[in-house]
Amino acid sequence: QEFHFGPCQVKGVVPQKLWEAFWAVKDTMQAQDNITSARLLQQEVLQNVSDAESCYLVHTLLEFYLKTVFKNYHNRTVEVRTLKSFSTLANNFVLIVSQLQPSQENEMFSIRDSAHRRFLLFRRAFKQLDVEAALTKALGEVDILLTWMQKFYKL
């Protein structure tokens, strides 16, 4: 059982544990999300992503979650259960990112660019909200990310 993001294979990640970690904090996160009209991981970001694109996109999205979302939210929360869940998610995201090596070859430029444009849509939506709201919404949308990642899961 592994993820196949196009040519990028990821082993050793157990999706069940990611879901368990997310569900442990889901109600808290989504209850704190007051801006229900907006969505960060909108349709245009995740719809019809090709296998070739998927490696670039998941790499940039998970790196953003690690460097911006988990890192900042970690400093804002004190509840042990919440911290434990975020640690589980973050550790698994690190494991995924560490195994992703998107090709930097010139012939992949258009695919890389397409994935980057998708990521920019997500980042733009994130930056339009104030920091607290953006972090909360991003964490509340981890289920959207995990559901999309299922498309690249192999039994």
Epitope: P15, K26, Q43, D143
Partner: antibody, heavy 119, light 106 residues
């Protein structure tokens, strides 16, 4: 080899209660989320409930909220569905299913147990 | 709540191609599973994650998913493919099944 064996189905009167069991083998039970799915006579599949591998997270279909409780005993490799205030529309074959992703990827199913609610 | 729409029945001539569709709002962003069920039997997973085939499922079964429609295709349909087929997704902590399509092989 993955095996799921349901039991506990019976004929019960409206308003009655029933506890279904699903004995699992062939995989590390507590690593996987599990679900109950039912099928009324001549009808389609209807998801009933879901429980995470650690048992901490549970979800229910609207039709069963407040009347059903899903649980698991990881030491016994067994999944349960406690149903109360049963109605005639709960008559169905109840299947337990192993979730291979954690959010509705049912690669393995039991053979089902028949629940009939009738006076 | 999320809904999936399937046409109740599809007919196909033996060894021809059958297409069964599943409609849902922005289903293309969700991961779609397809199950085959024969009378008196439990469902069997035939396609998962839109287009992946579990081991043991014949190569004639394939899947696609884009926009508001997911499609299960049986190329060179065999008599034993006659069954009910259900699409399924996960949405907001709920598993959702389509109403089912009965495939008749003529």
């Amino acid at each position: 080899e993955v095996q799921l064996v349901e039991s506990g189905g019976a004929l019960v009167q409206p308003g009655g209660s029933l506890r279904l069991s699903c004995a699992a083998s062939g995989f590390t039970f507590d690593d996987y989320a599990m679900s109950w799915v039912r099928q009324a006579p001549g009808k389609g599949l209807e998801w009933v409930s879901h429980i995470s591998g650690n048992g901490f997270s549970t979800f229910y279909a609207e039709s069963m909220k407040g009347r059903a409780t899903i649980s698991r005993d990881n030491a016994k490799n067994t999944l349960y569905l406690q149903m109360n205030s049963l109605k005639s529309e709960d008559t169905a074959v109840y299947y337990c299913a192993k979730d291979d992703y954690g959010s509705g990827l049912y690669a393995y199913w039991g053979q089902g147990t028949q629940v009939t609610v009738s006076s | 709540s999320y809904e999936l729409t399937q046409s109740p029945s599809v007919s196909v001539a033996l060894r021809q191609t059958a297409k069964i569709t599943c409609g849902g709002d922005n289903i293309g962003s969700k991961s779609v599973q397809w199950y085959q069920q024969k009378p008196g039997q439990a469902p069997v997973l035939v396609i998962y994650a839109d287009s992946r085939r579990p081991s043991g499922i014949p190569e004639r079964f394939s899947g696609s998913n884009s926009g508001n429609t997911a499609t299960l295709t049986s190329s060179g349909t065999q008599a034993e493919d006659e069954a009910d087929y259900y699409c399924q997704v996960w949405d907001s902590s709920v598993a959702v099944f389509g109403g089912g399509t009965h495939l008749t092989v003529l």
